[in-house]
């Protein structure tokens, strides 16, 4: 029935934060639809987002099965209303994505300071252990569960009256820092995976300052 005017997808891009993973591509479809397939290097192709007019596909459910695997996706283009039709080579047009290894490449989401507590000249700062969509034994794992000691947090802290930011680091979710008595401090944290060469750091958490809601002060 003649050739069809479908165009191949392009600019296939992985967008992933804390393992929530979406494949995006172009162009916006005109008289065509898309289907996505995903596979590990050694596995079979699995189809997702069938005949969609979207230019994104949430592949989280697939990649969380094994975040240390390397995945490849491909996007097929079909004529709208005639998805059985194929390209001139006898099969639908498709484009491959770059390879994606979630454990090495997912962006670290913005962390949150859960609480801070001052006892005398020490302050304990706790970072919220964010839940991911990675599951083990039907339970969602936290970021710390997934990354273990590969994940560290950097705490930036400073006197409210000063600009210089001191740093502390931890491979747990807690910091214990020394502060000057009678001074108010502000805090911000960053998640870091030091062993990475790309996507090493999260954006900074919102700044929290002593004398505000989150903290607790105890004079000892």
């Amino acid at each position: 029935s003649g050739t069809t005017n479908t165009v191949a997808a392009y600019n296939l891009t992985w967008k992933s934060t804390n393992f929530k993973t979406i494949l995006e591509w172009e162009p916006k479809p005109v008289n065509q639809v898309y289907t996505v397939q995903i596979s590990t290097k050694s596995g079979d192709w699995k189809s997702k987002c069938f005949y969609t007019t979207d230019t994104e596909c949430d592949l989280t459910d697939e990649i969380v099965k094994d975040v240390k695997q390397t995945y490849l996706a491909r996007v097929f283009s079909y004529p709208a209303g005639n998805v059985e039709s194929t390209g001139s080579a006898g099969e639908p047009l498709y484009e491959n994505s770059p390879e994606f290894t979630p454990y090495l490449e997912t962006n670290l989401g913005q962390p949150t300071i859960q609480s801070f507590e001052q006892v005398g000249t020490k302050v304990n700062v706790t970072v919220e252990d964010e839940r991911t969509l990675v599951r083990r034994n039907n339970t969602f794992l936290s970021l710390r569960d997934v990354f273990g000691k590969d994940l560290i947090y950097t705490l930036y802290y400073w006197k409210s009256s000063s600009s210089g930011k001191k740093t502390a680091k931890t491979n747990t979710n807690e910091f214990l820092i020394d502060v000057d008595k009678g001074e108010n401090y502000c805090f911000s944290v960053q998640a870091v995976i030091p062993s990475r060469t790309v996507n090493r750091k999260s954006t900074d958490s919102p700044v929290e300052c002593m004398g505000q809601e989150k903290g607790e002060f105890r004079e000892i």
Partner: antibody, heavy 120, light 107 residues
Framework: EVQLVESGGGLVQLGGSLRLSCAAS????????IHWVRQAPGKGLEWVGY????????YYADSVKGRFTISADTSKNTAYLQMNSLRAEDTAVYYC?????????????WGQGTLVTVSS | DIQMTQSPSSLSASVGDRVTITCRAS??????VAWYQQKPGKAPKLLIY???FLYSGVPSRFSGSRSGTDFTLTISSLQPEDFATYYC?????????FGQGTKVEIK
Amino acid sequence: EVQLVESGGGLVQLGGSLRLSCAASGFTIGGYIIHWVRQAPGKGLEWVGYIDPSNGYTYYADSVKGRFTISADTSKNTAYLQMNSLRAEDTAVYYCARDIQSVSGEFDYWGQGTLVTVSS
Amino acid sequence: DIQMTQSPSSLSASVGDRVTITCRASQDVNTAVAWYQQKPGKAPKLLIYSASFLYSGVPSRFSGSRSGTDFTLTISSLQPEDFATYYCQQHYTTPPTFGQGTKVEIK
């Protein structure tokens, strides 16, 4: 290959100013912390200050606070050390170094250094 | 600021000798201590991080250990290329501080 290259050193008058550059290649400075460390002739290493280029946060040694400013331009992948009100005791080789931001905070790569001489 | 007191300030040794350099922190720094080697006219090079971990490419004759606030760099069998100055550094808190250095000279 990871490399840090300092430039901008030289002879400067007492009370004068100088800007040092630290050009990075083989990695993106936004993912790391960059420190400046100096070494006076025949002396040991003295930490000067740091910048986290991802957020602009800095901290300085007391000996340079208020006189030195560290900045970074992530588009140029370069960190800078602006030195004002220079004193004789600021004469040193100045190094920039990369902090991988591990828990122990070691400096894994250093530049070759640039000599700053403050003369009266 | 945390002081790192390094000793000795210099030592003379022969090729094949076992050499030990120590650093004492003025307060707890956990394992956040690194050791660097510096040769004249050159930048320092990282040898040991996290008190006892050998940096990649560094010969296995170098080792580091910790006992409380005392940190030790050991060269098990000194080689000609090891004659240099060695520095310890803590980065447990800001500002990071260096020891005064130990110059290892040929006997």
